[in-house]
Interface confidence: low
């Protein structure tokens, strides 16, 4: 039987009363063209919402916009509009929130095309008043805020100057010019590519690396011939020119760029792209296109310097500089990352790994699904999960693949089942195990999403006619139970719900459309009365995640150590609560080899676990360039995974090796290290 | 070591103010909230404010609204608690304490509390005509 | 605002002997509650956080235990340095507010 027809399915009482009696509808007294939606600080209840209309003149744009604001997680809005004077917002530019519960927004305004500067208003009490400021600039990028101090802003300027708050956007001071790119590192540092000829463009792979500690007080050049950088994790990237050709190679930096390292990777050239997939203070998942217009490239893993790399999947698809990829964190489980690869025969299909890149493998096929058209073998197929390259074809996918780090093993998407991503209709499927198994969930494409730390999960069916019902299931998707929360049926635009899934309020947003009017409307459904009782001790489970084999005394053990987490039993109809902590309780793994990747100048031979020394580098000086200096390079050929935490068992000791290499990278070589004062 | 040093002890006289300093070290300052937590002589622990180094926002006890005010300085890793209107009943220990998690001007508090680890030594502030 | 009760007031326990000490919340407070140890002339000293976990350096024998309302600070054998005036202090939601303390004497 389908999902949600069992016999078995524990139904909620009452709940139509309960939810009619917490249906909040909000009808706005515009329809502009775009509405967008922003929350202010976490568990406020704060929500912004803006709605433009943009009217092409032949000389100018003409625009009008309005302002809203909730403090009820959107059951009840008021206009605020006469707060930033009516003035017309620039959608391109959205709102930006400042971090955490800092309470700051910053709008920018639309100024006419003669003024000297652009236009800003600021609020610092969670957008109850706001401020206007005129800029002594014309705005090219967002505001952004310093993760340290919301205090601190900077932005770039049309002229491609770089200007810097420390007044929260009340005063502002361009501390450079011909600048291409900026961004915040930490401690308040700024890192930023500057052009000395004619343009960022023109001057790819010249720019010069910028860092300034001290907002613009003194800069130190830290990189020269630069093409790109980036941030992940504790890792400064910067893709580099090399000497003789017009290839590039990447280096990395851990201390904010005073001293750089040649990263292990392969050098691309003009037309080929390298980028950071994923990082964090452990380590990076970095994408090297191939050469030519394949479409694809390969992901390599890096040890905890960032210098080491080893290969971890082939044929990655990526289609293009700044394009679609579909890698994706799970963020609902340890380890687990989701991406498609483009196969010989051009069909593209969906691997999953649990230990961080170390093993890809096919998802396993749903016990509740039969192969589809793709399949050549019927019994035997994956799941193939519909990610952002399935929505930028336009493929009925109207969402990307989710996971809450608070809602444990949860994963929720839109897939096909057979041997390769299908162009047919997709299903929904939910994995309750972090990816290892999983379920059809719903019939035909969904929104869905995610409320009080997977305790609900609500979906709206994806349809071109107007809509009127919700779905819901407090049973990790097992049973669904459907909510008329309004008569006149609404074309509907979308889900909103508070980031971090620990509400359990949804907002329903489309509008209404007849003979005479057409209106934005809001639907707020509180769940709370349908989660009636606080969850207690009773209501977990415990759960071994990643648990594969009972058996296996390290059934578990990923990256040196099992989590046993306490899970809401699927039976139990009650509230995880907006206080609610993930409970998990980690134990050390005994050591194997699967804990170590090669170090340089090592390799694993198909299907062994030992590392060995690679024939081609026997002998030869390593073109390995540790911190711009010539010194050897001391390893065992075995280096611990970056956040493995084993202890003891295997211990991959051998001839400790000196391997005699030479700096051929002058990047940064000390007479092009310069510090400046302003 | 993580070190919260205080200003030295003050007398003053009812109707005045007075203005406690606390600085912070061994740690990044703006990566914690500050408590401030007074105790009259031979009474309980009192929570009067928390201050967020970041921004400066602010959230007080609501006996102390009107009459406190809470500032950081980040170029010297400082906060001061100045406390107007002085009356006899203020005379206590005023200590300054690191608290890892604090609550935002708007509202409630964080999910998962971690306690105020650090203390200053205490500043004696006496009030007396 | 939530108000935090100590009991008892006062315990005479001799040393070597276990000692527990309640604190009641007015409302719930989840397990956002912090224990706290003072000495005469000296500033508090964390104990305890998130009702349960032991702050750094806290010997084993300090243990707490609770959830929502009630709460227990337990000393499994009281050493001569354990004498001292202890604290709750809840922080679920604004204003912070402490217990009125319970002072632990030498019987």
């Known amino acids: 039987s389908a999902p949600g027809e069992d016999e078995e399915c524990g139904r909620v009482r009452d709940f139509v009363a309960k939810l009619a009696n917490n249906t909040h509808q909000h009808v706005f007294d515009d329809l502009r063209a775009s509405v967008s939606l922003s929350w202010v600080g976490d568990s406020t209840g704060v929500i912004l919402v803006l709605t433009t209309f943009h009217v092409p003149l032949v000389i100018m744009t003409f625009g009008q916009s309005k302002l809203y604001r909730s403090e009820d997680y959107g059951k009840n809005f008021k206009d605020i509009t006469d707060l930033i004077n009516n003035t017309f917002i620039r959608t391109e530019f959205g709102m930006a929130i400042g971090p955490e519960n800092s309470g700051k927004v910053v709008l920018t305004a639309e100024v006419s095309g003669g003024s000297r500067g652009g236009r800003i208003f600021r609020s610092s009490d969670f957008a109850k008043n706001f401020v206007q400021t005129d800029l002594p600039f014309h705005p090219l990028t967002q505001m952004m805020y310093s993760p340290q101090n919301s205090d601190y802003l900077l932005a770039l300027s049309t002229e491609n100057g770089l200007w810097v708050s420390k007044n929260f956007g009340g005063k502002w001071e361009e501390i450079h010019k011909a600048v291409c790119l900026a961004k915040w590192g930490s401690d308040n540092t700024i890192f930023f590519t500057t052009y000395a000829n004619g343009s960022c463009k023109a001057d790819l792979g010249a720019l010069e690396l910028w860092r300034t500690s001290d907002l613009g007080k003194s800069f130190k050049t830290i990189g020269v011939k630069i093409y790109s950088f980036g941030l992940g994790g504790r890792f400064l990237f910067a893709s580099v020119m090399a000497d003789k050709d017009t290839t590039r190679r990447i280096h990395v930096s851990t201390d904010q760029g005073d001293t750089w390292s040649m990263a292990q990777l392969p050098s691309v050239g003009q037309e080929q792209f390298y980028s950071i997939l994923a990082a964090n203070d452990d380590m990076v998942f970095m994408h090297v296109d191939e050469p030519g217009d394949t479409g694809f490239g390969t992901i390599f893993t890096s040890d905890d310097r960032g210098i080491v790399y080893s290969k971890s999947l082939d044929r990655h698809l990526y289609t293009t500089t700044g394009g679609e990829t579909d890698f994706t964190n799970v963020t609902s489980l340890r380890g687990v990352y989701i991406t498609s690869v483009l196969s010989e025969d051009n069909s593209i299909q969906t691997m999953i790994t649990f230990d961080q890149g170390g093993r890809w493998t096919h998802l396993r096929k749903p016990e509740n699904s039969e192969c589809d058209a793709t399949a050549k073998n019927k019994n035997e197929c994956s799941l193939h999960i519909h990610a952002s390259y399935s929505i930028s074809q336009k493929l009925n996918v109207p969402m990307a693949p989710l996971s809450e780090p608070n809602a444990v093993g949860i994963v929720i998407a839109h897939g096909s089942v057979g041997d390769a991503i299908s162009v047919m209709v997709p299903d929904v499927y939910i994995s309750d195990d972090g990816g290892y198994s999983w379920t059809k969930m719903l019939e035909g494409p969904h929104y869905y999403t995610i409320l009080d730390s997977g305790g609900i999960i609500v979906a709206i069916e994806h349809s071109s006619r107007p809509i009127n019902v919700i779905k819901f299931s407090t049973d990790e998707g097992q049973c669904w139970q459907t909510y008329t929360f309004t008569r006149d049926p609404i074309y509907f635009t979308g889900l909103a719900s508070e980031p971090g899934a620990r509400s359990m309020n949804i907002s329903i947003w489309g509008f209404t459309e007849s003979f005479l009017t057409s209106q934005w409307v809001s639907y707020t459904i509180d769940f709370k009365d349908i989660l009636e009782r606080n969850c207690e001790e009773k209501d977990y489970t415990i759960w071994l995640a990643h648990s594969t084999d009972p058996e296996d005394y390290e059934d578990g053990c990923i990256l040196g150590y099992k989590e046993q987490f306490l899970r809401l039993r699927k039976s139990s109809v009650c509230q995880n609560g907006r206080d609610y902590v993930v409970t998990k309780q980690p134990s050390i793994c005994l050591c194997s080899l699967e804990d170590f990747l090669c170090d340089f100048g090592y390799y694993r031979p198909e299907n062994d676990s030992k590392c060995v020394e690679q024939p081609e580098l026997k002998g030869h000086d390593l073109e390995f360039c540790l911190y711009g200096r010539e010194e050897h390079l001391t390893t065992n050929g075995y280096r611990k995974i970056p956040g493995d935490k084993c202890q003891g068992g295997v211990n991959p000791v051998r001839e400790v090796k000196d391997l005699k290499k030479k700096c051929t990278s002058n990047f940064l070589s000390p007479e092009k290290q310069n510090s400046k004062s302003n | 070591q993580v070190q919260l040093v205080q200003s030295g002890a003050e007398v003053k006289k009812p109707g005045a103010s007075v203005k406690v300093s606390c600085k912070a070290s061994?740690?990044?300052?703006?990566?914690?909230?500050m408590s401030w937590v007074r105790q009259a002589p031979g009474q309980g622990l009192e929570w009067m404010g928390i201050?967020?180094?970041?921004?400066?926002?602010?959230s007080y006890a609501q006996k102390f609204q009107g009459r406190v005010t809470m500032t950081r300085d980040t170029s010297t890793s400082t906060v001061y608690m100045e406390l107007s209107s002085l009356r006899s009943e203020d005379t206590a220990v005023y200590y300054c304490?690191?608290?890892?998690?604090?609550?935002?001007?708007?509202?409630?508090?964080?999910?998962?509390?971690?306690?105020?680890?650090?203390w200053g030594q205490g500043t004696t502030v006496t009030v007396s005509s | 605002e939530i108000v935090m009760t100590q009991s008892p007031a006062t315990l005479s326990v001799s040393p070597g002997e276990r000692a527990t000490l309640s604190c009641r919340a007015s409302?719930?407070?989840?397990?956002?509650l912090a224990w706290y140890q003072q000495k005469p002339g000296q500033a508090p000293r964390l104990l305890i956080y998130?009702?349960?976990t032991r702050a750094t350096g806290i010997p084993a024998r300090f243990s707490g235990s609770g959830s929502g309302t009630e709460f227990t600070l337990t000393i499994s054998s009281l050493q001569s340095e354990d004498f001292a005036v202890y604290y709750c202090q809840q922080a679920r939601l604004g204003p912070w507010t402490f217990g009125g303390g319970t002072k632990v004497e030498i019987k």
């Open positions: 061994g740690y990044t300052f703006t990566s914690r909230y």
């Open positions: 409302q719930s407070v989840s397990s956002n």
């Open positions: 304490a690191r608290d890892p998690s604090g609550i935002a001007a708007a509202g409630p508090a964080s999910r998962y509390y971690y306690g105020m680890d650090v």
């Open positions: 201050i967020n180094p970041v921004g400066g926002s602010t």
């Open positions: 998130g009702a349960s």
